[in-house]
């Protein structure tokens, strides 16, 4: 169930994450799947395990194979498999399909190209970018953190983009390259009157006095990039920032794009240490865009502390 493909080039660093998650404090054991032989954790080895990460510094073609990781949590062990393939370096410029990471699409409004897998590495700027093997030069190209920004994107900007960076491990430097295709698409989105998915209109949320409570305002606005779209919470018709109660804060969720292409936003209202007076407030989830504003109202009610759910759940 938990198998992940990873690939790299010989003589470059490759770092692979266990496909099963866990907390940093949980032990992760790595094995060569074929032999069940444990992978060492000592950093003096060329291939070694470091918690959730398996490091090839540098990788060799012979390292190709399946690796097993077992996350040992306080409850159950969880197993993942990393299917690693190390390829010989190509002499020509063409990057074969099997070395390509997922294609990204950009448009005039959004032209970020993220460098794949870079978050696994200990890298420092500068991050170098190449298109079809040519180093990118000119003011239209800006390497920012772990991504490339292209200004005024045109259809000619489509192509294969390679990022190159240096991974540092205990003072030793290793090169890493990663390539992905970039396509340019016309913005063909549309905008709708906001649709609030949560909370339901006039929902009553049960809370416990003295405990923390979360309310999520979730709404969709159409397809594609939205020019103006926002979700927010109001208390008794007042913006959270103006209400002046530090226990009650709103926190922006991630922009969400669902499989049906809808552009949706979340805003979480966090109420710390719920008090009696919080039950008297009216909580409004507002979703607005160029078409207008939609409002769903929520009220809080006290959860009976001797309720069965409170005891066992």
């Amino acid at each position: 169930k938990f198998s992940k493909q990873s690939w790299g080039l010989e003589n470059e660093a490759l770092i692979v994450r266990c496909p099963r998650q866990g907390k940093p404090s949980y032990t992760v054991d790595w094995y060569y799947s074929q032999t069940n032989k444990s992978i060492p954790t000592q950093e003096r080895n060329r291939v070694f395990a470091s918690g959730q990460l398996l490091k090839f510094l540098p990788a060799e073609v012979a390292d190709s194979g399946i690796y097993t990781c077992i996350v040992r949590s306080p409850t159950f062990n969880r197993t993942g498999y990393a299917n690693v393939t190390i390829y010989k370096k190509q002499s020509d410029c063409n990057v074969p399909d099997y070395l390509m990471y997922s294609t990204v699409s950009g448009s005039e409004k959004n032209s970020k190209i993220y460098c794949p897998t870079i978050d696994l590495y200990n890298w420092t700027a500068p991050l170098e970018w190449f298109k079809n093997c040519q180093a990118l030069q000119g003011s239209r190209y800006r390497a920012h953190k772990s991504f490339l920004v292209i200004d005024n994107v045109m259809t000619e900007d489509a192509g294969d983009y390679t990022c190159k960076f240096i991974h540092n491990e205990n003072g030793a430097n290793y090169s890493v390259t990663a390539t992905r295709s970039f396509t340019v698409k016309d913005e063909q989105g549309f905008s709708l009157f906001p649709v609030i998915g949560a909370p339901a209109q006039n929902e009553i949320k049960e809370v416990e006095i003295g405990k923390n409570a979360n309310l999520t305002c979730s709404a969709c606005f159409g397809k594609g990039t939205q020019f103006l779209a926002a979700v927010l919470w109001q208390l008794n018709g007042t913006k959270i920032t103006d209400f002046g109660e530090p226990r009650i804060q709103q926190e922006e969720g991630q922009n969400q794009s669902f499989s049906n292409g809808l552009a949706c936003l979340d805003m979480v209202l966090r109420i710390a240490d719920v008090k009696e007076e919080d039950l008297l407030l009216q909580y409004d989830c507002l979703a607005l865009n160029l078409h207008g504003l939609r409002r769903h109202t929520v009220r809080l009610s006290r959860k009976n502390p001797i309720d069965h759910h409170s005891i066992y759940c």
């Epitope: 169930k1 099963r20 998650q21 866990g22 907390k23 077992i70 949590s73 306080p74 409850t75 159950f76 062990n77 969880r78 197993t79 066992y312 759940c313």
Partner: antibody, heavy 121, light 107 residues
């Protein structure tokens, strides 16, 4: 087909003993944890505990520790939940559920059909 | 014990609506969270494991997200057969604990 088949409904009096069963088939019974979940009438799910039939290792929720016994007979691929002295508050639906192997786990992926236990004088 | 707080406790939505259920853990549980569907008179059924992985055979309209303490379960387009109670469950620590459940009804 992987399945867990539970014993039939029981009607008992307070103070009586009871042992309900859960028979596993279609998979390696000794390699998977089997657990029990209680659902009182009109209420939610409560995890009671688990057993690893391969070595009879058990884990209990503190709420059920000492109240029930969980056992297994690997020769007949069956897990058991038993009470030595039933109370009216034990009236509930009891489900057995498979909890993954000693090396891998991804939720309670196979459930029995449930056994209704009614305790009434 | 880790407390799992699920909300709302019940909701009513129309066929085709997007339905969202939230689950909050009283402490960090990484992504060790599962979602179950229980139809009236039936045993629960695993839908999502490890917060976001769809169990084999489960329709793609069901999805899950989140990590740490805050988790979301979504039905992208509610169908009549989705009438059920949905439970979240953590398995980061013993005892395993369930949320109080969310009863989903059709308007």
């Amino acid at each position: 087909e992987v399945q867990l088949v539970q014993s039939g409904a029981e009607v008992k009096k307070p103070g009586e003993s009871l042992k309900i069963s859960c028979k596993g088939s279609g998979y390696s019974f000794t390699n998977y944890w089997i657990g029990w979940v209680r659902q009182m009438p009109g209420k939610g799910l409560e995890w009671m505990g688990i057993i690893y039939p391969g070595n009879s290792d058990t884990r209990f929720s503190p709420s059920f520790q000492g109240q029930v016994t969980i056992s297994a007979d690997k020769s007949i691929t069956t897990a058991y939940l038993q009470w030595s002295s039933l109370k009216a508050s034990d009236t509930a639906m009891y489900y057995c559920a498979r909890h993954g192997t000693s090396s891998d786990y991804y939720g309670l992926d196979v459930w029995g059909q449930g056994t209704t236990v009614t305790v009434s004088s | 014990d880790i407390q799992m707080t699920q909300s709302p406790s019940s909701l009513s939505a129309s066929v085709g609506d997007r339905v969202t259920i939230t689950c909050q853990a009283s402490q960090d549980i990484s992504n060790y969270l599962n979602w179950y569907q229980q139809k009236p008179g039936k045993a629960p059924k695993l839908l999502i494991y490890d917060a976001s992985n769809l169990e084999t055979g489960v329709p793609s309209r069901f999805s899950g997200s989140g990590s740490g303490t805050d988790f979301t379960f979504t039905i992208s387009s509610l169908q009549p057969e989705d009438i059920a109670t949905y439970y979240c469950q953590q398995d980061d620590n013993f005892p395993l604990t369930f949320g109080g459940g969310t009863k989903v009804e059709i308007k």
